[in-house]
């Protein structure tokens, strides 16, 4: 067995997807296995194609830690094995997401509408793009809350939780206070499971321009734009 194309080393940021390629040839056509830090690859997807006695293997990885990845091409002539190896390193670049200067601050929730939904001591993000953030955000919830009076008993508690956690996002304190978005999965559960009918009606009304103010639109998150808990368990807030 002979390796024609060795996998290349990469220096990537945490949470990146990387595809390692390994191409080998031989008679008979070799098999390719991948080794991660000396062990069989535990995660990632492998795709293979064979053409004209050349095997091409692609290992796609979701990078959460550095590692040494080895491609091993093996074939057998009678009783003799022939093996070729090639390795690549995946290193994680210094992770420095530039700090956004979020316009706001962290404070304990002192309103009424979301009292039963938000954790008692939790810090929420108050957006200083409003003149009076607490009042403005409370009014946003209140307006949307009134519309929930007509929804089903199954939908209502889920929608209330989503609204409160979306408008009063959990706040990570620090030099730059940072709002933590809701996990996509929770948003989708409300949209597709608990409130499927209601969500459709609301989207329909939105498209037809039946909502007079943009206030209501602000109170409904776009699930697809939210981070997934599978990308990084700490990247979003769980309801």
């Amino acid at each position: 067995a002979r390796i024609l194309r060795a996998p290349e080393s990469h220096n990537v940021t945490f949470g990146s997807f990387v595809t390692l390629h390994c191409t080998a040839t031989g008679i008979p056509v070799p098999t390719i296995t991948w080794i991660e830090n000396g062990n069989a690859v535990s995660s990632g997807s492998i795709q293979e194609s064979v053409k004209d006695r050349v095997i091409d293997s692609r290992l796609q990885l979701f990078i959460t830690k550095p590692g040494l990845y080895t491609c091993i091409a093996t074939n057998k002539h009678g009783e003799k094995f022939s093996t070729a190896k090639a390795a690549a390193t995946i290193s994680i670049a210094e992770w420095s997401k530039p700090q956004k200067d979020n316009k706001g601050y962290c404070a304990q929730y002192r309103g009424e509408v979301c009292n039963a939904v938000l954790a008692k001591d939790a810090l929420v993000f108050l957006n200083t793009s409003y003149a009076d953030p607490e009042e403005a955000q409370e009014l946003l919830v209140h307006t949307a809350w009134n519309e929930l009076k007509v929804v089903s008993p199954v939908c209502r508690p889920a929608a209330e939780a989503l609204l409160c956690n979306h408008i009063f996002q959990e706040c990570s304190p620090g030099v730059v206070p940072t709002p933590i978005p809701i996990c996509r999965e929770y948003c989708l559960a409300v949209k597709e499971l608990f409130c499927a009918k209601e969500w459709l009606v609301m989207e329909e009304k939105t498209h037809r321009g039946l909502y007079r103010s943009e206030m209501h639109l602000l109170s409904v998150p776009e699930c697809s734009k939210l981070p997934s808990m599978h990308w990084d368990p700490t990247a979003c807030a769980r309801l």
Partner: antibody
Framework: EVQLVESGGGLVKPGGSLRLSCAAS????????MNWVRQAPGKGLEWVSS????????YYTDSVKGRFTISRDNAKNSLYLQMNSLSAEDTAVYYC?????????????????WGQGTLVTVSS | DIQMTQSPSTLSASVGDRVTITCRAS??????LAWYQQKPGKAPKLLIY???SLESGVPSRFSGSGSGTEFTLTISSLQPDDFATYYC?????????FGQGTKVEIK
């Protein structure tokens, strides 16, 4: 390798002034908030001041408000602490400390890298 | 300001011992708490943040737990390198405050 090196400490009389500097290397200085933390001889740690990456957010502990000014020059990879109206209570080792956010980008990680400190002595 | 109180102030232990240090906050800080280790003449070193998240490169014998007002730092099996002073720090709200420190000394 991340390095923070403080300088500018020394002996100063009560009422006097001093400017501390912290030279940063080994990381993208302009992407990080920076802090000053002090420790009086034989005592515990006390947070003094913080400044965000673009200087939009600045905070001080009550005892230094109006006397100390934190600033930074991202082009020079430097953090500063201008200390005026010094008193004996300000005698301490002053540490420059970096902070960061964890990999998610949301959760704050305080004081993950520290300098070796510079001693400020206020005495007549 | 939020007051942080550590106990005990001094702790005598032997290599291999399980050591627990407690930190109490005067009001709830949810999980916004960090732990540091400091050796004489050296700068502090971050061990734990967000009450229980282990900082990269810190040995797994260190662990943090707790939420609200009561927190603990545990060293599962004390090593010679662990004799030092430990500080907790809240970063729930400014002013950020530290505990007074716990000195872990050789018995």
């Amino acid at each position: 390798e991340v390095q923070l090196v403080e300088s500018g400490g020394g002996l100063v009389k009560p009422g006097g002034s001093l400017r501390l500097s912290c030279a940063a290397s080994g990381f993208t200085f302009s992407s990080y908030s920076m802090n000053w933390v002090r420790q009086a001889p034989g005592k515990g740690l006390e947070w003094v001041s913080s400044i965000s990456s673009s200087s939009s957010y600045i905070y001080y502990t009550d005892s230094v408000k109006g006397r100390f000014t934190i600033s930074r020059d991202n082009a020079k990879n430097s953090l500063y602490l201008q200390m005026n109206s010094l008193s004996a209570e300000d005698t301490a080792v002053y540490y420059c400390a970096r902070d960061r956010y964890d990999r998610s980008g949301y959760y704050y990680v305080p004081f993950d890298q520290w300098g070796q400190g510079t001693l400020v002595t206020v005495s007549s | 300001d939020i007051q942080m109180t550590q106990s005990p102030s001094t702790l005598s232990a032997s290599v291999g011992d399980r050591v627990t240090i407690t930190c109490r906050a005067s009001q709830s800080i949810t999980s916004w708490l960090a732990w540091y280790q400091q050796k004489p003449g050296k700068a502090p070193k971050l061990l734990i943040y967000k009450a229980s998240s282990l900082e990269s490169g810190v040995p797994s014998r260190f662990s943090g737990s707790g939420s609200g007002t009561e927190f603990t730092l545990t060293i599962s099996s004390l090593q010679p390198d662990d004799f030092a002073t430990y500080y907790c720090q809240q970063y729930n709200s400014f002013s950020w405050t530290f505990g007074q420190g716990t000195k872990v000394e050789i018995k």
